[in-house]
């Protein structure tokens, strides 16, 4: 009699994550009597995937009715494939007995799963840095397969070169992750700047996935201070202005000191934005010269975004 053959026609099958995979298997003979089982992997550690007689395999269904008389098709369909389903699947014929005895295995079908990378997530530094300092941004994307992937960084459309990228794991895996760090030199003009992490993969339909971060979250632009005196008014009052310019973020407290004593404290709020994203603020102080015998030392003290205070002083001359 002709020897029983277990035929798995496809050496390999590739599917997209989320789709269904059909693994084909036919036998050449109905005898000897005994069940067919599907396993992933070979040897003692193999994993039972489908057994018609018993067990609960919610994602696996038989393609044709295995209980039908003279059925020789034992193909299965696995639904909602994930990268974790990748591996080699074997259709195995058993001879009925107590227990059943393994008789013949098919050659195996390798299931390969292609999975899209997750949307890249870009994170910036935990604390703000000032212009002319370098800050690091990190981009992460997960769950893709195959391993080949390209990641590029851009700042305002220009590709960055100070980049370090790793794809993990280094060896064979069902899916992979990428992590990249870009070092960005900040300038005073970067409040409106943006960094983009762009990930391209074979599973994406020509359009890379993008993650973005705004440099406004990472930068601090310290203010310039200028104290000036307006001309003396007829009522012996002098108007002194403190101009605080080109600062970011808006969080700023200004204190006037007269001869070292606090005269007034103000908080910046609802300021109009400059074209470059920075802010300007002007504060005025009226000084009654006739109330002073000596020159008055006025100090404009600015505390910006929790940083140490910056002072600018000015002396108002009191003529004898």
């Amino acid at each position: 009699e002709e020897e029983l053959q277990v035929i798995q026609p496809e050496k390999s099958v590739s599917v997209a994550a989320g789709d269904s995979a059909t693994l084909n298997c036919t036998v050449s003979s109905l005898i000897p009597v005994g069940p067919i089982q599907w396993f992933r992997g070979a040897g003692p550690g193999r994993e039972l995937i489908y057994n018609l007689k018993e067990g609960h395999f919610p994602r696996v269904t038989a393609v044709s009715d295995p209980t039908k008389r003279n059925n020789m098709d034992f193909s299965i369909r696995i639904s909602n494939i994930t990268p974790a389903d990748a591996g080699t699947y074997y259709c195995v014929k058993f001879r009925k007995g107590s227990p059943d005895v393994e008789l013949k295995s098919g050659a195996g079908t390798e299931l390969s799963v292609r999975a899209k990378p997750s949307a890249p997530v870009v994170s910036g530094p935990a604390v703000r840095a000032t212009a002319e300092h370098t800050v690091s941004f990190t981009c992460e994307s997960h769950g893709f397969s195959p391993r080949d992937i390209t990641l590029k960084w851009f700042k305002n459309g220009n590709e960055l070169s100070d980049v370090q990228t790793n794809v993990d794991p280094a060896g064979k895996s069902v899916s992979y992750s990428i992590r990249s760090t870009a070092r960005v030199l900040l300038t005073r003009r970067d409040v409106h700047s943006q960094v983009i992490c762009e990930v391209a993969h074979v599973t994406l339909q020509g359009d890379p996935l993008r993650g973005t971060a705004n440099l406004s979250e990472a930068i601090r632009v310290p203010p310039f201070l200028e104290v000036t005196q307006q001309s003396m008014r007829a009522d012996n009052q002098v108007n002194v202005t403190c101009q605080v310019t080109k600062f970011y973020p808006q969080r700023l407290q200004l204190t006037w000191l007269e001869n070292g004593n606090v005269s007034r404290t103000e908080m910046a709020s609802a300021l109009p934005e400059n074209k470059d994203g920075t802010y300007n603020w002007t504060s005025w102080l009226l000084v009654n010269v006739s109330a002073h015998r000596d020159d008055v030392k006025l100090t404009c003290q600015v505390e910006h975004d929790g940083q140490p205070a910056v002072n600018k002083s000015f002396s108002v001359k009191v003529s004898a």
Epitope: S14, P146, D148, V202, T203, Q205, D207
Partner: antibody
């Protein structure tokens, strides 16, 4: 699911020509589409692709001579200034459902002949 | 740009023969290689993708192997309808560009 090219004809050197690719059974907004050509008796040559969102990418030799664009149902290849070496059958094709590394649906082709 | 070198450029074989066509890439393309069959006056037809995966509806006598730079298309038992020209096509995941081999014409001996 199918694709079909149109617009191929006899054209004079230096004149423009636009070829179209009409798709049915799937959406152009879901797949990368490509243009290829084959000169008489020669092999296949890649021209360029357009991404699902409409971004075109070209083979390095194209050098601005061709422009790929699309509407909701058609993809176009604009040949800015025909040359005699552009005489070929032009094919459009769609990438496979698993990724952009292969093309599984091809049109029958449209013939462009450039001659004065 | 990546160059794809296909060999032989043509071959003569008989029905039932085992036929092997090779394709070599000028740099690694991992497994991003497809094989197409084209008959005169017709569009190419996809046979194999990802170097070794048989496209649906393609007879199992066609098989592909290889990765990196060296790839092979094998027809285990040549049938009358298999006389055609075969092309390999690469995709490079960094440049995201495609290149074809120059083709192999399989003729009747």
């Amino acid at each position: 699911q199918s694709v079909e090219e149109s617009g191929g004809r006899l054209g004079q050197p230096g004149t423009p020509l636009t070829l179209s690719c009409t798709v049915s059974g799937f959406s152009l907004s879901s797949y990368v589409m490509g243009w290829f050509r084959q000169a008489p008796g020669k092999g296949l040559e890649y021209i360029g692709i357009i991404s699902s969102s409409g971004s075109p990418y070209y083979a390095s030799w194209v050098n601005g001579r061709f422009t790929i664009s699309k509407t909701s149902t058609t993809m176009d290849l604009k040949m800015n200034s025909l040359r005699s070496e552009d005489t070929a059958t032009y094919f459009c094709a769609r990438v496979g459902p698993l990724g952009v590394d292969y093309f599984n649906i091809w049109g029958p082709g449209t013939l462009v002949t450039v001659s004065s | 740009d990546i160059q794809m070198t296909q060999s032989p450029s043509s071959l003569s074989a008989s029905v039932g023969d085992r036929v092997t066509i090779t394709c070599r890439a000028s740099q690694s393309i991992n497994s991003y290689l497809a094989w197409y069959q084209q008959k005169p006056g017709k569009a190419p037809k996809l046979l194999i993708y990802s170097a070794s995966f048989l496209y649906s509806g393609v007879p199992s006598r066609f098989s592909g192997s290889g990765s990196g730079t060296d790839f092979t298309l094998t027809i285990s038992s040549l049938q009358p309808e298999d006389f055609a020209t075969y092309y390999c096509q690469s995709w490079h995941y960094i440049s995201r560009s495609y290149t074809f081999g120059q083709g192999t014409k399989v003729e009747i001996k």
